[in-house]
Each structure stands twice: as C-alpha cells, then as structure tokens.
Interface confidence: low
Amino acid sequence: GSGIFQLRLQEFVNQRGMLANGQSCEPGCRTFFRICLKHFQATFSEGPCTFGNVSTPVLGTNSFVVRDKNSGSGRNPLQLPFNFTWPGTFSLNIQAWHTPGDDLRPETSPGNSLISQIIIQGSLAVGKIWRTDEQNDTLTRLSYSYRVICSDNYYGESCSRLCKKRDDHFGHYECQPDGSLSCLPGWTGKYCDQPICLSGCHEQNGYCSKPDECICRPGWQGRLCNECIPHNGCRHGTCSIPWQCACDEGWGGLFCDQDLNYCTHHSPCKNGSTCSNSGPKGYTCTCLPGYTGEHCELGLSKCASNPCRNGGSCKDQENSYHCLCPPGYYGQHCEHSTLTCADSPCFNGGSCRERNQGSSYACECPPNFTGSNCEKKVDRCTSNPCANGGQCQNRGPSRTCRCRPGFTGTHCELHISDCARSPCAHGGTCHDLENGPVCTCPAGFSGRRCEVRITHDACASGPCFNGATCYTGLSPNNFVCNCPYGFVGSRCEFPVGLPPSFPWVA
C-alpha cells in the first residue's frame, strides 16, 4: 500500500511568547514544528516514529496563521508518506519549538527549546475529508486539520490496491475509485489488453491488434474475413474452405483451368463446321464439303474432289472447273469413252466387258484397284473415315483407325471417359485430365484414388505451437503449421533469433 498522512497547520497562538519551561523567548518565540506519526498506542511513548516524522521551517513568531503552500520550503499541508497498508489507527505527536537559529533548517540549530506539544491517538479512515481539531494548554493554542489519502495510483479503504492507468500494449484502462480497471473504449479482457474487433469480424478466421480492425488469418479474405481464398492458381473454381478449388461447370483440372467445353467457350470451328468436345481443351471440327483444315478454315479447290474420270485432268475456273479428257474419252467428266475392248483399255489386270453392242466397255477391276480403267490403286483413307483426330492407316486390303487417347471404336467415334471406370474410392469426385483422372477426396480420405483413410484429424491434437494455424491434407504428414511472425519449425516451436548454441536452426 501507499498513502500520505496530511497535516494542515492552520493557526498557532502563543500570545505571551512563552516556552514550556516557563521562560519567555527573546525577542519572540521563532516557532517551528516537529511531527511524529506512529502506530496506535493507548499510551503514547517515546521511540521511533514508525509511520514517519517531519519538521517545518520557522513558520512564525509567537502567534501566527500558517498559509497553505504546495511546494518549496514550509510546505503545508505537511506530508507524511507511508508505504504500507493504512491500518486505520494512529498516534500523532505535534511539538512546537523555538529556535534562535536558521529559519529554514531550525532542526540543525543548537539551543532549540520546546514550546508545547500535543498528542492525538485514534482511528482515521482514508478519505478526502479533513478532520479539524484544536488543542489548548495554559500557554498555547494550535488549530490543525488532518487526513489520510492514497498516493497516486493507490486505491481502496487502506490504500492497498495499486492501479496505474495506462494505454499501451499491456493494457488500455483507467482506474475506478476502488482501484478496479475500467477499459478504455474498444478494449476488453481482464487487463483490457484485448481489442474489440470490427463488428462482425469472424471469430475464428479473423483477429485484430487494435479496435475496429479485422485482420484475416491465412486462407481467408474479405472485410470480415468470412471469404475463403481458393488454391493459388485456381482459374475457374471456388472454395468453401481455404486453398480449395472446386471447378465451375465446364472446367476441370487441379486448377480448374482445363476447358471441358471448349466448343461452347471458344467456337473454334469455322465455316459452319460441326464442333465436338473431346476432353480437356480437346475438340474436333467436322467440315462441310468444300472446306478443310483443323478448324475448317481453308476453302477447297473445285478440283479437290477429283471430278474428272478416266485420267482426265482438272482445271479450276471461277466458281467451276473444266475436265481435259485423254484420247478416247469425252463428256463433262470424261465419263464417255470412244474406246472398245479391242483397245485393251483395262489396266492392272482388269477384265473388259463390252456394252452397247460393242460400242463401249466397262472394266472389272481386281482387288485394291479402282477407276473406270482400273488405273487407281485403292486408298481406303481418302474418305477421312477416322473421327476425333484419329489417324487412318492402310493395312493391305483394309485400313484401320489409330485413335487419340480417350477415343475408341472402328472410326474412333466413341469417347472414353477416364472416369467411366470410377477410379475414385470412398465417394471421391473424378476429373478427366490429359494425363489421366484426378480424384478430389471427401473428408477423412486422401491419396491419388482416395484409397487412404485418415484415421484422425491431424490438427485435432493441436500440434502447432505459438498460435500457429493448422491445416490438413496439404502434406504427407497430413498437417501443416502456418507460423506467426517470429517463429519457425515444422510445428512453429522455435523463436527466430535463437542463440548460436541452440541445437536446431531453420
């Protein structure tokens, strides 16, 4: 505890200027006071002033009024500070002395003489109210007041409760009359050291270091820290927990950046061709007649369909073509012959059959040859029979389609989904990617195919120290600690700036 016993000397009367021994002061009693404050004694005895003592300078001669002074010599009220719990009782001895010596420090002068003394014993509660008294003896009268008040920062009935108002990171409060704390606006907690965050700031996902603030923990964003941050690089997806990337419709892949509906999103096929989706970023354009190219962007020559028969050569003309027929043929496409079987028109072992009474003929071609004169070797790939980007290959008398990944069928017309065989266990969600399927696992499972059962929540045991945030499913250990500033280590257990002798260094 800590307080001050204050004694206010008001008036001293010694009209005859007499000492206690009956002698008179010459030229007058130059009066100073000695005060002794001690614990309560039923009978006041000599001995140490256990609660303190103080002396005044010379305050006047014989009779005088004592003026209040707050500083300097002759301070009044007189201050008797104590550094213990005020017991509520006391004994007080006030002595008036005459000094022939120094005004300011009469204590040190030889030849001081007692004028009078009074003794007060009793109880006194802490408070601002002055208790006023007056003591008389045959020669003198002393008017005075006294009280006990607590020192700055001490409170309570016995000045035993210490409370220092403060406004720093250890607390933000003022002191109540009883010494209890009264938090400044915006602060709460036992020591008023916890800021009251922005109203609505998410209790778990947000925090603050000063009032009306909302700072987001890792993985969260927004004014109130109630919006999760998706996985870094997530293009066309959302999250319901941090670092998730749940793809929007039509998108796939870990980062939802693989277009599952390229035809709709990009319309790559030109000139009225038909677009077919074929996996992430995959598509095929089926061209209308007269167009070619990956996107059907190239217009074909009028001769591209080889309209001239019997070896006729084709010449492009504006909006049309013209066939130059070889000897023995005529017609728009050189389809009419002037030859007969007698001219041996059939090549490659073709058999000649006369028609129209021998005025024309027809060749019957052996396998792998075609044309009106069996002059062309059959190419079974010319009709582009393979769909979805399949490669056509001639294999002797037949041809085969070599399909791109994800397609099957004789003409690669069937789309195979990697997810069709349900590779994801325990209800995992499957995503078709170019390099194979990827599974998004439900809570409690992990692994490439969701085949590993997580037997417990790795964060439940609170493995992270020093206020670090715990996340699961991001590492082989099944948890990751996100350290606050100033800490490192797999569990954030080591403060930054360790002494060199410390056995672990990040």
Epitope: Q10, E11, G60, F64, R67, S71
Partner: antibody
Framework: EVQLQESGPGLVKPSETLSLTCTVS??????????WGWIRQPPGKGLEWIGD???????YYNPSLKSRVTISVDTSKNQFSLKLSSVTAADTAVYYC?????????????WGQGTLVTVSS | SYELTQPPSVSVSPGQTASITCSGE??????VSWYQQKPGQSPVLVIY???ERPSGIPERFSGSNSGDTATLTISGTQAMDEADYYC?????????FGSGTKVT
C-alpha cells in the same frame, strides 16, 4: 453567512494614494482558516490578485505591485484595508475584497460586490 | 512571473459539454481554483483544490489538474452558465489568475 463590503473614494487623482477598506460581517476576521485579500479588475479585462493578509498581520503581495501596496488588518473593527500609492490611469479598476479559505486551498469563497475606482485628474 | 493561459472564448450548445483549459508550467503541482463571473457581478468560486466543489455548486461543474494543464468541465451546460471563467493558482506566496475564458 459572512459578507464583505468595500468602501472608499471612487475617484483618485494620478500620483496619489488609493485607499480602500473592507468590512467583514457575519463572521470574525480572527480565524486561522482564512486570509483576507484584495483583487482588482480593469474595465473589460481579467482579474488581478493584489495581495492578502492574515488576521495576525502576515502579508503577501503581487510582486508586480509590491513596491506600491500596503495591506493592513484591524481586528477590533473586523476590517482590513488596501493602500496603493502613486496611482496612474492603469490602476482604474473595480476593486474586490475577498475571503480566501485555507480549507479550500486558498480559494476565495466569499467576495464583496466590488467598488469602481477611477484614476483621473 | 508565473503565468496562466486560457482560451479567450469557448462556445457550447445547451446540454452539451464545455471544457475550459488553463495552462502553466508545472501547474499539476499546484492547487487550482476556478471562478465564475457573470456581467456586473462578483466572481463565484466553483472549483477548489483542482476538483473539489464548494457546497451549493451544481454537480455539472468538475475539475481536473495534471501535468501543465488544469481543466474545468461543465457537462450538460445550461443557459445560466454563460459567463466568464477564471482559473487561479498560488505561485510561491502570490495568487495568480488566468486570463479568463468567455463561455457562450
């Protein structure tokens, strides 16, 4: 309830001495609880403390006026007085007497109604 | 000589709080009194010893003193509080008044 009343001439010539008396009624001037003071206020301006006295006669003066001021007490008449010498027009003011309470930290808890003193030839 | 400085004027709406400051070097170590003076009247003590109210002074008057500044606060100001206000302290043996503040 204690009352204070100033009295004295309302007009003083320059270089002369201004003299005022304050009469205390409803209470004794013989008390160690009080000082008896003089304060003045030039027209339209603020208050200026002149000085005070205890009933024992101890006096305290404003340093800026000390050379010209004398305050005295007459306990038999329950009065105290102010004398201000060598006055000039700058001394024209309303002069108040007041009781300064020791228990109030020297606060003036009772004032006279004031008297206007004009310094003019 | 010791000086006490006050703002010349303070305006306040009825019912609002008026704060009048009084500044002086080390003022927190001295007892400060505050006086109210209405036109044509004598000053009236409203605060003594920094924050104490004499009997008869309304509770809406309060005072504080720390550092180099003492403050008189009138909460819930009423029309009757319109007046000049002076702070006063004791420097050594002499009384010193502030320059005064007109509260309207």
């Amino acid at each position: 309830e204690v009352q204070l009343q100033e009295s004295g001439p309302g007009l003083v010539k320059p270089s002369e001495t201004l003299s005022l008396t304050c009469t205390v009624s409803g209470g004794s001037i013989n008390s160690g609880n009080y000082y008896w003071g003089w304060i003045r206020q030039p027209p339209g301006k603020g208050l200026e403390w002149i000085g005070d006295i205890s009933y024992t006669g101890s006096t305290y003066y404003n340093p800026s006026l000390k050379s010209r001021v004398t305050i005295s007490v007459d306990t038999s008449k329950n009065q105290f007085s102010l004398k201000l010498s060598s006055v000039t027009a700058a001394d024209t003011a309303v002069y108040y007497c007041a009781r300064e309470d020791v228990m109030y930290g020297g606060g003036g808890d009772s004032w006279g109604q004031g008297t206007l003193v004009t310094v003019s030839s | 000589s010791y000086e006490l400085t006050q703002p010349p004027s303070v305006s306040v709406s009825p019912g609002q709080t008026a704060s009048i400051t009084c500044s002086g070097e080390g003022l927190g170590d001295k007892y400060v009194s505050w006086y109210q003076q209405k036109p044509g009247q004598s000053p009236v003590l409203v605060i003594y010893e920094d924050s104490e109210r004499p009997s008869g002074i309304p509770e809406r008057f309060s005072g504080s003193n720390s550092g180099d500044t003492a403050t008189l606060t009138i909460s819930g100001t009423q029309a009757m509080d319109e007046a000049d206000y002076y702070c006063q302290a004791w420097d050594s043996e002499a009384g010193v008044f502030g320059s005064g503040t007109k509260v309207t």
